[in-house]
Every structure is written in C-alpha cells, then in structure tokens.
Interface confidence: low
Amino acid sequence: GWTLNSAGYLLGPHAVGNHRSFSDKNGLTS
C-alpha cells in the first residue's frame, strides 16, 4: 500500500515521492 509520511512524501514499495522537488531523490530532476 501507499502511505503519506510526516514530510508529505507518498511512500510506496520504492519510496516514490509525490511532491517531487530539488531534494527528492525519487524524482527525475537529477
């Protein structure tokens, strides 16, 4: 399942972030 952590990140099987930004490792913004 998917859960929202305290920092507002949507955590799934691979901790993929829904609020991607400059600091989000799981985003595409390198």
Epitope: A7, Y9, A15, H19, R20, S21, S23, D24, K25, L28
Partner: antibody
Framework: EIQLQQSEAELVRPGALVKLSCKTS????????MHWVKQRPEQGLEWIGR????????IYDPNFQGKASITADTSSNTAYLQLSSLTSEDTAVYYC??????WGQGTLVTVSA | DVLMTQTPLSLPVSLGDQASISCRSS???????????LEWYLQKPGQSPKLLIF???NRFSGVPDRFSGSGSGTDFTLKISRVEAEDLGVYYC?????????FGGGTKLEIK
C-alpha cells in the same frame, strides 16, 4: 521524528579547510538526496550541490566546483560538507536539506585571520 | 544557469492588506517531465527557510489558505490575501527543474 542536527559554529583562518556535519535521524539517509545551501550574512540563498548517499553520486553548482565537497556516511546517517581554501567570501551560514521540507538549523562559518 | 529575478526587493504592507510577489525565470522552468518545479519559501529572522508552495501552486501541509501561488513558463506570483504579523520575513522563489537549482534574490515583507 525527522531531525537534521548540524555541527557547531566554526571560526577558521583564511586558506584553511572546514568540514561541517549534518547528523540525521527519523529516516534512512540512503532514501533521499542530501543538499547543502549557503547563506551569506544578510544575503540570499545559494544551492551548493547534493549527494545521493546510496552511491556517493554528487552534483554541484559550477560556482562551488572545487570549493565544496559533499560526502555522506550511511552507517551513521550523516552528511558532510567540506569547504577548502577558505576566504572571507565563504563566511556564511550553511544549511543541510533533506527533502524540500526538512532543513537543518544551519552552521555559521566565519573566516577570519 | 537559470536566473530567478524577484520583485519587489522590499514590500511594505499594512496588516490585513494583500501582498503580491513576482518571480521571473530567465528561461522556461518546465521540466522535461512536463511539471514545473517552482517553489516559494519563507524565512523568518533567525530561522531556517520553510516551504510554503511547491510545483507553482500547491500549498504545503499546514500552510494557511491565504497563501496562493500561480504562473507558468517563466512568470510566477505568490499572493498573500490578508497579511498577518506571522507572515513577515523574506520570501524566496526557487526552481528545482534545471541543474544548478537556483533561488530568487528574496523579497522582504515588512510592516508599513
């Protein structure tokens, strides 16, 4: 609870180097990029660069290439920023950042003879 | 590098007034994935910056609805509908679409 605890203020001599630490808790550092941001006194914010602690891959703003080195120790969940050949231009507060929500309290580095 | 230009540098307001801050980027900050990673932060004196808005117009959790973000391409705006004392500080825009990531120069919101 997510915490980023940065090292104490540093007073360093011109030409020296300094290594700042950012001890994290409440999350696994491997799961996030760790960034460093510079703020000179009464000035704005500058992005220095970031590291992927899982593989030590780092990228930098070209302005900080050769000046800054970002490393991480996954065993202690700590990120580091090393600054070399310090000058008065390096006098600033340095923040570590995890996710765009979580910032450390900042470390003041003062470069003075 | 993407230059982020904020105006005004200083914004004197009366409590209860509306405030508007502009941020222009020197090139499009639409990412190749189609999203625009434009954020707004507030830094109060002696504190670390705090996120207000992400991806142009999304309020972060806990941010009052008097804050709103808008814009597209290269032109972005942060509006505060009714300024309260706790809103005073320096506001920064930030682009997280293109490396190196860059901040605007800041806008100081102060009491008139």
């Amino acid at each position: 609870e997510i915490q980023l605890q940065q090292s104490e203020a540093e007073l360093v001599r011109p030409g020296a180097l300094v290594k700042l630490s950012c001890k994290t808790s409440g999350f696994n550092i491997k799961d996030y990029y760790m960034h460093w941001v510079k703020q000179r006194p009464e000035q704005g914010l500058e992005w220095i660069g970031r590291i992927d602690p899982e593989n030590d891959n780092s990228i930098y703003d070209p302005n900080f290439q050769g000046k800054a080195s970002i490393t991480a120790d996954t065993s202690s969940n700590t990120a580091y920023l090393q600054l070399s050949s310090l000058t008065s231009e390096d006098t600033a507060v340095y923040y570590c950042v995890r996710g765009y929500v979580d910032w450390g309290q900042g470390t003041l580095v003062t470069v003075s003879a | 590098d993407v230059l982020m230009t904020q105006t005004p540098l200083s914004l004197p307001v009366s409590l209860g007034d509306q405030a508007s801050i502009s941020c222009r980027s020197s090139q499009s900050i639409v990412h190749s994935d189609g999203d625009t990673y434009l954020e707004w932060y507030l830094q109060k004196p002696g504190q670390s910056p705090k996120l207000l808005i992400f991806k142009v117009s999304n309020r972060f959790s806990g941010v009052p609805d008097r804050f709103s973000g808008s814009g597209s391409g290269t032109d972005f705006t942060l509006k505060i509908s009714r300024v309260e004392a706790e809103d005073l500080g320096v506001y920064y825009c930030f682009q997280g679409s293109h490396v190196p990531y860059t901040f605007g120069g800041g806008t100081k919101l102060e009491i008139k």
